[in-house]
């Protein structure tokens, strides 16, 4: 079965600096990456960015750069807001459409127990879809 | 037919803002992403940043983080980009162009464009 | 920033030739280059998206080809209305970049 594991890490040298990393865990072909917060796509998430795997990438704020790290993996940094830890509570999803298996999603969140530069662990939490 | 009309020409003082507009019609406002480029003899063109009507959601290049403020009315069909604290850097010519919100269709470029409206920051 | 060059600034022709205009990336962007073409005092009109696809209404003397990094824009059979700036614009990653322009004119 097809998984997809979230990890959204805090720089150690900026406190309020993010990054999301997601990664597809399956044999398809990854057909497009969605990333999202406060929730799944298109379930009272907000879109952050969208990655082709071809025809590039698109994004939104607070999201100041996504890029692909392998072909079945992804990371979008967070804009520095100026606030301590603004994306600390939030939760981020990602969400894989790859062919022939159709769309996976997973979200996580920062540990609240998480020291800089720890991030959470690289297995789905119980959100995780099969559309 | 597609048209993004943009406000006319503008002459301003350093340290004022200024709003320019860009009306579009002939589609749907709110299938397409609005982004703002910014045309120099120097620099050539830059893009400045991006907004979804639909949404509200905003990209920008760094470079112009502060500097442009990208909105959009889907009353009128009409987006925005106000430019602050401007200096004789800012003079430019300034484009509004559409981009495709759908991958689906896989046409992702700027279709059309806006015919301009030059600024000219000078006291 | 990925940077997009046109290193050349200016392509001299004539009517009736044969003429590519390239741009490198400085980095691997796949497919995801446009064409655009600006004559004085106009607004850029699309002319290739996806590298190789002309947009619509654009004759086909106007070619696009590459990947990676390497792309070109050929215009064959060069007509007196093809006189003006061309542009490339990379869409992998943001901000989008594009060349510095190369400007046709003629010999």
């Known amino acids: 079965t097809p998984e997809v594991w979230v990890q959204v890490q805090m720089e150690a040298t900026e406190l309020s600096s993010f990054t999301v990393h997601c990664g597809f865990l399956g044999p398809g072909s990854i057909s497009l990456v969605t990333v999202s917060w406060g929730g799944p796509d298109g379930a009272g998430g907000t879109k952050l960015a969208v990655l082709h795997p071809e025809l590039g990438t698109r994004q939104w704020a607070p999201a100041r750069q996504a890029r692909w790290e392998t072909q079945s993996s992804i990371s979008l940094a967070l804009e520095d807001s100026g606030a301590s830890s603004p994306f600390a509570n939030t939760t981020f999803c990602c969400k894989f459409a790859s062919f022939p298996e159709g769309s996976w999603e997973s979200c996580g969140s920062l540990p609240p127990s998480s020291d800089p530069g720890l991030s959470a662990p690289p297995t789905p939490v119980p959100i995780l879809r099969a559309d | 037919q597609v048209q993004l009309q943009q406000s006319g020409a503008e002459l301003v003082r350093p340290g004022a803002s200024v709003t320019l507009s860009c009306k579009a019609s002939g589609y749907t406002f709110t299938d397409y992403e609005m982004h703002w480029v910014k045309q120099t003899p120097v620099h050539g063109l830059e893009w400045i940043g991006a907004?979804?009507?639909?949404?509200?959601?905003?990209a920008y290049n760094q470079k112009f983080k502060g500097k442009a403020i990208l909105t959009a009315d889907k009353s009128s069909s009409t987006a925005y980009m106000e430019l602050r604290s401007l200096t004789s850097e800012d003079s430019a010519v300034y484009y509004c162009?559409?981009?495709?919100?759908?991958?689906?269709?896989?046409?992702?470029?700027?279709?059309?464009w806006g015919q301009g409206t030059t600024l000219t920051v000078s006291s | 920033d990925i940077v997009m060059t046109q290193s050349q600034k200016f392509m001299s022709t004539s009517v009736g030739d044969r003429v590519s205009i390239t741009c490198k990336a400085s980095q691997n962007v796949r497919t995801a280059v446009a064409w655009y073409q600006q004559k004085p005092g106009q607004s850029p009109k699309a002319l290739i998206y996806?590298?190789?696809n002309r947009h619509t209404g654009v004759p086909d003397r106007f070619t696009g080809s590459g990947s990676g990094t390497d792309f070109t824009l050929t215009i064959s059979n060069v007509q007196s209305e093809d006189l003006a700036d061309y542009f490339c614009l990379q869409h992998w990653n943001y901000p989008l970049t594009f060349g510095a322009g190369t400007k046709l004119e003629l010999k």
């Open positions: 996806l590298a190789s």
């Open positions: 907004i979804d009507p639909e949404t509200g959601g905003t």
């Open positions: 162009t559409r981009w495709i919100t759908t991958v689906v269709a896989t046409l992702y470029y700027f279709d059309y």
